[in-house]
Interface confidence: medium
Amino acid sequence: SERCDDWGLDTMRQIQVFEDEPARIKCPLFEHFLKFNYSTAHSAGLTLIWYWTRQDRDLEEPINFRLPENRISKEKDVLWFRPTLLNDTGNYTCMLRNTTYCSKVAFPLEVVQKDSCFNSPMKLPVHKLYIEYGIQRITCPNVDGYFPSSVKPTITWYMGCYKIQNFNNVIPEGMNLSFLIAFISNNGNYTCVVTYPENGRTFHLTRTLTVKVVGSPKNAVPPVIHSPNDHVVYEKEPGEELLIPCTVYFSFLMDSRNEVWWTIDGKKPDDIPIDVTINESISHSRTEDETRTQILSIKKVTSEDLKRSYVCHARSAKGEVAKAATVKQKVPAPRYTVELACGFGAT
């Protein structure tokens, strides 16, 4: 057989589907690897072939499309399960070929079980809602293409194990779930169960996503440097350890990169010929506001180091701020017998 362009196992597409539910899986070749779509390939005389390797097996085998009730079928570039079974788990390959051309890619499919409260090993998408921001909606994901627009499914929404009805601020509206005003108590897993008929059978699609309530852009402020500040003076003797924390509060901002850094005499610590270490820790509030602390440490500070300028800088999408630490050399306490005696005019 002719050489085939093998794109290998596409682990970026970790496809997880629930047991005993319909699943439609598009061949990734046309989505990520090739510059043309299925229609173009089909009209050019290319054929799409599917096969699979069962879990814990090495043997590639054809997919059985002759199962009762067409449980597994192919339609254009989509592989259909109506419904899935647990032992459908494995690596699936789609291959596009004719006599002169061949390209293939494999992807893992995992069929997972869920309990009566929709708990499962499924990786859940996270949807962020702004706290107290007016009406916001989440939409039941990944249900397109399962039934024609003429079919009117029934949709039931759950929070955790609880059917959503008579919630103070959460209203099911078909495929959408509306949050009249989002509170932190709305954090959690939300599940939509879509039920639709097909050829005399009833199918269910279960989709769960995690809602995380985050700080509102209305309340977002530029970074706030809590330390260093004007109330604290870092007074050290040469040879002592100098520790200066830079603690910065960042409002939550979607997709903002929060940065904290030190400069010493206007330069990055790496560019200064002194032995400086910087340790960073990060904590988050309930609404994902972030507090970053960078501790600048000089194990044995010199009198030269105590004359330098130490500035903490912070930047987010809301702006940039800086604050200098007040560093001083400690004046040694006078030794009474010599210095004070001299001061009192003793000879």
Epitope: S185, Y249, S251, S285, R286
Partner: antibody, heavy 122, light 107 residues
């Protein structure tokens, strides 16, 4: 008017499990903007948050007690419960249950039980 | 964990005095702070939430201010029933923590 009432033994032996129940009346434990919490106060000392639960059963615990604490909810009885295992004399305290309200977007414990003094002693 | 430091720990005052209690957080907590009043043998009572919002039914002589790391509870004119212990609490992040308390005594 919402009311919370703690119930459970006032004396627990060292190494045993402390069990308390909080019964909520005058409102539903299943409200979607309430958390339900346990807070304790050793005699003559300050307040310490133990943990909170949402009506769906999701919990948050104080890391200092997490290995010993369990909070559960029974929506049918409008109750939530605290279990603290392997108790020592240091767990002697007044245990309060409280409602943590989020309807403003800012939490606060706006309703409290009257408190239940639990003494750990053999 | 976020530490809350209340000052002073004890405060002697007379009826009619203006009293100020400070709560300092070890890191920024925006306005996620509440104040409680506790009398001996009783459960704490919520006075202020969101740093400055007066809880329904609480007298207007109580007020709260601050944001970030520095917060203040002020009683504009101390009344006999205000002699109690006051606690601040941060609700910004888990674990929820309380300040050590400020006991307001009669001078």
């Amino acid at each position: 008017q919402l009311q919370l009432q703690e119930s459970g033994p006032g004396l627990v032996k060292p190494s045993e499990t402390l069990s308390l129940t909080c019964t909520v009346s005058g409102g539903s434990i299943s409200s979607s903007t309430y958390y339900w919490g346990w807070i304790r106060q050793p005699p003559g000392k300050g307040l310490e948050w133990i943990g909170s639960i949402y009506f769906t059963g999701s919990t948050d615990y104080n890391p200092s007690l997490k290995s010993r604490v369990s909070i559960s909810v029974d929506t049918s009885k409008n109750q939530f419960s605290l279990k603290l295992s392997s108790v020592t004399a240091a767990d002697t305290a007044v245990y309060y249950c409280a409602k943590e309200d989020d309807s403003s977007g800012y939490y606060s414990f706006d309703y409290w039980g009257q408190g239940n003094l639990v003494t750990v002693s053999s | 964990d976020i530490q809350l430091t209340q000052s002073p720990s004890f405060l002697s005052a007379s009826v009619g005095d203006r009293v100020t209690i400070t709560c300092r957080a070890s890191q920024g907590i925006s306005s996620y702070l509440a104040w409680y009043q506790q009398k001996p043998g009783k459960a704490p009572k919520l006075l202020i939430y969101a740093a400055s919002t007066l809880q329904s039914g609480v007298p207007s002589r109580f007020s709260g201010s601050g944001s970030g790391t520095e917060f203040t509870l002020t009683i504009s004119s101390l009344q006999p029933e205000d002699f109690a212990t006051y606690y601040c609490q941060q609700v910004n992040s888990y674990p929820l923590t309380f300040g050590g308390g400020t006991k307001v005594e009669i001078k």
